[in-house]
């Protein structure tokens, strides 16, 4: 997931004028930018964030929003603060009219503005079976650990904090911060206003259909009684969470948004920052058949979004939408019909659907697995999820076919037992957002803080590509494909695994050109070879076949196109070992398939050749796909054949470090 | 009607900065890659920069580090930022446009004089 | 880099004759390779790309060839508004994009 896509509109106003004779005026060129929703019914005008550059203190925070008030009443205009942010993000919400909007952008300190917009609940017993491992029987649902060690914050409407399902399980705290209901013949009806939210609470940990039923729960309303928030009341609640994190340390923290409006850049940020505080978030991918990436906080990378499936695992139907999917969603868990407390009585129950449902199963499981391992990271968590989920059982058929490459085929489920999956070597698939169609137009794939990039591949619809490279970028490595003139666009998968006291480089060989191919290998000590990437300047590869793949003796080698530059990823790490498999078809084949077996686990997907008609090459799960042009295009022609190239790798520290434990 | 309008261009020192600047008509700009060309007094034509509109960048090797390109998309406007100037600096510098159906650059602008000289 | 010769320097000829300019990668560039005319005092304005396909507003007379390290530009009979230089450009390695130093194309 990553903050670069979506119909997001973003208008920028340069800070040119030193008007108002500023104290403190920005650098020359440097430019602060306005945002709105790109869907226009969800734009909340005349409320407005104002985002402050990183290292603004509240002192200075509070004295822009008084600098704002000061020239806008020179204006004959009225302002008003109405939060000053500090804790998740420096800022301040003021509501005011757009004529202001230049003369805000000019501040000193202002990173930039956000028109304030709307959220909504995503919602419109199969569901334990499905997350339960087969050796439980849903009527016995007994999970190892309830939770009882994690706190679940969840920002919804209010709840029934005395139903039965939940009652001493959720603590309701003071915060409220939600908009006016809409109509004016609207009627608050407590078991309507609080719907949503007790049926979530429940289903995260309720005594008889919760998932997590030893996990405390803190709710905070941020949704009003029709489901509808605003994008700086879910902030403050975010800031609120941060604080009371602050003041009150406990355990591990889960919080669940199961709500979603429109792409936002400053929500995404709220969520990134609570995010590496340690907190882990879960949000609903949204409910509009969709890209999830168009919405915010689904977008967030890191954020654990979700969608939703039913008990045929069947991506959900809601009315003529459905549950989102791309690649900003990490899994789907179940969120149809879902039985769960309801509002109406004490005892009463009642089914709803939705990715807020989904969401609210990931994170009642993500609570047991923190109680069973507290000191899991966010990163070992999501691999976690992903890896204990249930693989390609979803049907792709659903989603639209540009996206089926790009959705998770997962299903979350509960680890057969909460222990000992430490030995295992976590690596997950993260594409990036699509590069756009002109030739210099490039697409970044990034990983997570704690994981390490040990393969990096591109795949194009068109074939026309110029390969990928990993590069360094702000202390990390990231994975970078490339366009080509004539391509509709690229995309970059990095694979990005979990791999303590990792030691990793890129080496590179220029292209062989005189040669029959470049190749490169790991020649430092102790280094293994985890994936090979290709990049090429010219635009057209020519049919050049490389030679014998890799000269025995010398696995830890990459080859490729005379014309191209070759990457490998060397690693070094306890105990890490890894192989190459490779799978070649001498006939045209549309795809061509590597595994890795048992107790190994796929770090690096290559294609060879790397010539034209290869569309490229990207993991699913432990497998390695290598995409080519239909094969009526091809042709039987030698040039036709391909060889898809899979690095397995395992780790006998970590087992060794797990049979200790055990 | 296309059109793109180059600024900036003047007479500056060596070890001076300058900042050029290119704004846009009749084309949605973010749309379109866009480069700089330069061309010093009776020479040929030479590739400076180019951006993508996402803001993928790329570079000639002689101005790699000193020259920066970047775009403003919502305000149809392209920038490049030169510092650590040189006398081999000098020329008319262009901006140009290149379409995902043709290749090569399709529009050129007037282009602004560079001149580096103490 | 991909380094791009011009042959001739100069070429003179006389209105209503044929022109014939050259140009040379020093590798292939398949075909990507495109042509530009420029008048003094004026920007390059593009001519052919893809070595042989003529861009808008340019008449049947241009036309080009070639493909590999070799390619031709012809002029069938030049007009006096044809007298300008005519530069070559390669597309298929980058960056950078390289250009050819020109043919001045003046009377006879």
């Known amino acids: 997931q990553e903050d670069e896509d979506g119909d997001y509109e973003e208008l920028v106003l340069a800070l040119r004028s030193e008007e108002d004779g500023l104290a403190e005026a920005p650098e020359h060129g440097t430019t602060a930018t306005f945002h709105r929703c790109a869907k226009d019914p969800w734009r909340l005008p005349g409320t407005y964030v104002v985002v402050l550059k990183e290292e603004t203190h509240l002192s200075q925070s509070e004295r822009t929003a008084r600098r704002l008030q000061a020239q806008a009443a020179r204006r004959g205009y009225l302002t008003k603060i109405l939060h000053v942010f500090h804790g998740l993000l420096p800022g301040f919400l003021v509501k005011m009219s757009g004529d202001l909007l230049e003369l805000a952008l000019k501040l000193p300190h202002v990173d930039y503005i956000e028109e304030d917009s709307s959220v909504f609940a995503q919602s419109i017993p199969w569901n334990l079976e499905r997350i339960t491992p087969p050796r439980y029987r849903a009527d016995e649902y007994q999970p190892p650990d309830g939770g009882s060690l994690v706190e679940v914050y969840l920002l919804d409407t209010s709840i029934q904090s005395d139903h039965r399902e939940i009652e001493g399980r959720v603590m309701v705290t003071d915060f409220e911060n939600v908009p006016e209901e809409d109509g004016t013949r609207f009627h608050r009806q407590a078991s309507k206003c609080d719907s949503h939210g007790t049926h979530l609470a429940g289903v995260v940990s309720g005594r008889d259909a919760g998932v997590a039923k030893g996990a405390s729960m803190r709710s905070l309303r941020v949704l009003n009684c029709q489901g509808k928030g605003t994008v700086s009341g879910t902030l403050i609640g975010l800031e609120f969470i941060r604080k009371s994190q602050l003041v009150q340390p406990v355990g591990p923290l889960v919080v669940l948004l199961p709500l979603a409006g429109g792409y936002s850049r400053v929500l995404n940020a709220a969520c990134q920052r609570l995010a590496r505080a340690g907190v882990v978030l879960v949000t609903a991918a949204g409910n509009f058949r969709d890209d999830a990436c168009l919405y915010s906080p689904a977008s967030a990378p890191e954020v654990i979004t979700v969608g939703a499936t039913n008990a045929q695992d069947q991506p959900v139907t809601l009315g003529t939408l459905g549950t989102n999917f791309g690649r900003c969603v990490d899994l789907f868990a179940p969120g149809e019909d879902i039985i769960g407390a309801s509002s109406d009585c004490s005892t009463c129950f009642v089914s709803q659907s939705g990715t807020s449902q989904a969401a609210a199963h990931v994170a009642g499981i993500a609570a047991m697995m923190l109680s069973a391992e507290p000191e899991l990271t966010l990163a070992e968590l999501r691999q976690r999820l992903i890896h204990f989920s249930a693989k390609d059982v979803i049907n792709e058929a659903w989603f639209p076919e540009d996206q089926r490459v790009l959705t998770p085929n997962l299903v979350a489920a509960l680890p057969p037992s909460t222990h000992g999956a430490g030995w295992q070597l976590f690596c997950r698939t993260v594409w990036s957002a699509h590069s756009g169609p002109t030739r210099m137009a490039t697409a970044v794939a990034r990983c997570a803080p704690d994981e390490e990039l040990l393969s990096c591949s591109s795949f194009s619809r068109s074939g026309k590509r110029r390969g990928e490279r990993m590069e360094a970028q702000g202390g990390k490595l990231v994975c970078r494909a490339h366009n080509a003139f004539g391509g509709e666009g690229v995309y970059a998968i990095a694979r990005c695994c979990l791999l303590p006291q990792a030691n990793c480089s890129v080496h590179t060989a220029p292209p062989a050109e005189a040669s029959m191919g470049t190749r490169v290998h790991c020649h430092q000590q102790g280094h293994v070879l985890t994936g090979c990437s290709s990049h090429w300047e010219v635009e057209d590869l020519g049919t050049h076949k490389p030679p014998v793949l890799r000269p025995r003796g010398q696995p830890n080698q990459c080859v490729g196109h005379r014309e191209a530059s070759i990457h490998a990823s060397c690693c070094h790490a306890p105990g890490l070992e890894c192989k190459v498999k490779e799978h070649g078809i001498p006939a045209p084949q549309e795809q061509v398939t590597v595994a890795c077996e048992e107790g190994w686990t796929l770090t690096g997907c290559s294609a060879l050749p790397g010539t034209s008609h290869v569309l490229g090459a990207y993991a699913v799960d432990n497998t390695c796909v290598v995409r080519s042009r239909d094969v009526s295009t091809t042709g039987s022609t030698s040039e036709g054949a391909v060889t898809a190239v899979a690095i397995c790798c395992r780790s006998r520290h970590l087992a060794q470090a797990s049979q200790e434990l055990q | 009607e296309v059109q793109l309008v180059e600024s900036g261009g003047g007479l500056v020192q060596p070890g001076g900065s300058l900042r050029l600047s290119c704004v846009v008509s009749g084309f949605t700009f973010g749309d379109y890659d866009m480069h700089w060309v330069r061309q010093a007094t009776g020479r040929g034509l030479e590739w400076v920069s180019g951006i993508a509109p996402a803001g993928d960048t790329s570079y000639t090797g002689s101005v790699k580090g000193r020259f920066t390109i970047s775009r403003e998309n919502a305000k149809n406007s392209l920038h490049l930022q030169m510092n650590s100037l040189t006398t081999g600096d000098t020329a008319i510098y262009y901006c140009a446009r290149e379409d995902i159906a043709v290749p090569g650059f399709d529009y050129w602008g007037q282009g602004t004089l560079v001149t580096v000289s103490s | 880099e991909i380094v791009m010769t011009q042959s001739p320097a100069t070429l003179s000829v006389s209105p209503g004759e044929r022109g014939t300019l050259s140009c040379r990668a020093s590798q292939s560039v398949s075909s990507n390779l495109a042509w530009y005319q420029q008048k003094p005092g004026q920007a390059p304005r593009l001519l052919i790309y893809?070595?042989?396909t003529r861009a808008t507003g340019f008449p049947a007379r241009f036309s080009g060839s070639g493909s590999g390290t070799e390619f031709t530009l012809t002029i069938s009979s030049l007009q006096s508004e044809d007298f300008a230089v005519y530069y070559c450009q390669q597309y298929n390695k980058w960056p950078p994009f390289t250009f050819g130093p020109g043919t001045k194309v003046d009377f006879k």
């Open positions: 893809g070595a042989s």
